[in-house]
């Protein structure tokens, strides 16, 4: 995270990762002021010539707000008042990547800090049980990711195999021509066994795993971001 | 090291038209906004226009404003001046200018242009 | 539109501290860049965002801002030191101060 205490008031953002097409949050907290009507908050983005966002007097002042933000920012209102101005960036953007500013004015004094804002697509893999196949494998799909991702299997029982050899990854563009689909197939699969599928850019880190035994199926799955410091 | 070069000026006579550039190296350019900022004989400087990284928005002085296009090439690394329709008041070092956020952190050694019949 | 008026000339002895306001209205709810040039030289940014020092500038060179004065303060200041300097804030396009003309006697 990135503080800036040297001015009078201390305002602290902390890096954060956006997915494409859904709503983001770039953090920012500061002392908090008494009077609202005290509090101005704006978002500037480096390489942008209008504001991103601007909240000042209990509102919002968007009258130089760049055209690229028009419609799909706001700040927690309600929240402004102890302390928070993070920003809620709407429909996020590839484009909206990039080095973005805090800059804070209330009735102590001002401060202002950094935060760097990644963008990209991830999504939660689910791993299944190819029964089409014609031996026993293991199928891991997760619907949206970019940049392209390195997709890994592993297994419990196997700790440290490099399973390159009998696995297969295809990657597929979306609708949207930005976004693929990841698909990867591991063969040779053994039952009473933990397989781990791991895919990972850099953005975000996601793993599906399937617990395969002669009585039942379990599936879980778990998404990580993998913020980098402001 | 981060470097910008004007170049283009000369001596031009009013009404005629002349183009700027500056070439930029050592950062990654179509991540930053720039500038072009003047300063005639014995005179203090003068904000000319802004463009963003990207280029989609641009802002003008009002003294240039209907005569003067700033534009980049991001695959060039180059930013641009056209300037239109000369005037006498118009002379003037130019010198291209990296912004950052409220500000700007580098400047280019300048280009002179002087508008005279 | 927004004005930024300086002094036309601040002079000082060598080893002295000098001092360079820059006035606009309310001028301390904005961010305030300071440059400095020498005669056939490009300007140089010596202090931005009211009071931070960009790397390779002295810590002689400081400034503060609010209300509706920003300051530029140089310490122990050298002949070196001589040049014009500019306040400088962001109002929908760069406004720059008047300048001023430092002189070490």
């Known amino acids: 995270f990135g503080i800036s205490g040297r001015h009078s008031i201390t305002v602290t953002t902390v890096a954060s990762a956006g997915n494409i097409g859904e709503d983001g949050i770039l953090s920012c907290t500061f002392e908090p002021d008494i009077k609202l009507s005290d509090i101005v908050i704006q978002w500037l983005k480096e390489g942008v010539l209008g504001l991103v966002h601007e909240f000042k007097e209990g509102k919002d002042e968007l009258s130089e707000q760049d055209e690229m933000f028009r419609g799909r920012t706001a700040v927690f209102a309600d929240q402004v008042i102890v302390g928070n101005a993070s920003l809620r960036l709407k429909n996020v953007q590839l484009t909206d990547a990039g080095t973005y500013k805090c800059y804070i004015i209330t009735s102590k004094g001002k401060g202002n800090a950094n935060l760097e804002y990644k963008t990209g697509a991830f999504s939660m893999p689910e791993v299944n049980v190819d029964y089409n196949a014609s031996s026993e494998t293991l199928r891991c799909e997760a619907p949206r990711w970019f940049p392209q991702p390195t997709v890994v299997w592993a297994s419990q029982v196997d700790q440290g195999a490099n399973f390159s050899e009998v696995s297969n990854t295809s990657f597929e563009l979306n609708s949207e021509n930005v976004t693929m689909k990841v698909v990867s197939v591991l063969y040779n699969v053994t039952i009473n066994n933990t397989y781990s599928c791991m895919i990972e850019n850099d953005i975000a880190k996601a793993t599906g795993d399937i617990k395969v035994t002669e009585s039942e199926i379990k599936r879980r799955s778990h998404l990580q971001l993998l913020n980098s410091k402001a | 090291e981060v470097q910008l070069v004007e170049s283009g000026g000369g001596v031009v006579q009013p009404g005629r038209s002349l183009r700027l550039s500056c070439a930029a190296s050592?950062?990654?350019?179509?991540?930053?906004?720039m500038n072009w900022v003047r300063q005639a004989p014995g005179k203090g400087l003068e904000w000319v226009s802004a463009i963003s990284g990207t280029g989609a928005s641009t802002y003008y002085a009002d003294s240039v404003k209907g005569r003067f296009t700033i534009s980049r090439d991001n695959s060039k690394n180059t930013l641009y001046l056209q300037m239109n329709s000369l005037r006498a008041e118009d002379t003037a070092v130019y010198y291209c200018?990296?912004?950052?956020?409220?500000?700007?952190?580098?400047w280019g050694q300048g280009t002179t242009v002087t508008v005279s019949s | 539109s927004y004005e930024l008026t300086q002094p036309p000339s601040v002079s000082v002895a060598p080893g002295k501290t000098a001092r360079i306001t820059c006035g606009g209205n309310?001028?301390?709810?904005?961010?305030v860049h300071w440059y400095q040039q020498k005669p056939g030289q490009a300007p140089v940014l010596v202090v931005y965002d009211d009071s931070d020092r960009p790397s390779g500038i002295p810590e002689r060179f400081s400034g503060s801002n609010s209300g509706n004065t920003a300051t530029l303060t140089i310490s122990r200041v050298e002949a070196g030191d001589e040049a014009d300097y500019y306040c400088q804030v962001w109002d929908r396009g760069m406004i720059f101060g008047t300048g001023t003309k430092l002189t070490v006697l």
């Open positions: 200018a990296r912004k950052r956020w409220y500000g700007m952190d580098v």
């Open positions: 050592g950062f990654t350019f179509s991540d930053r906004a």
């Open positions: 309310n001028i301390g709810s904005k961010s």
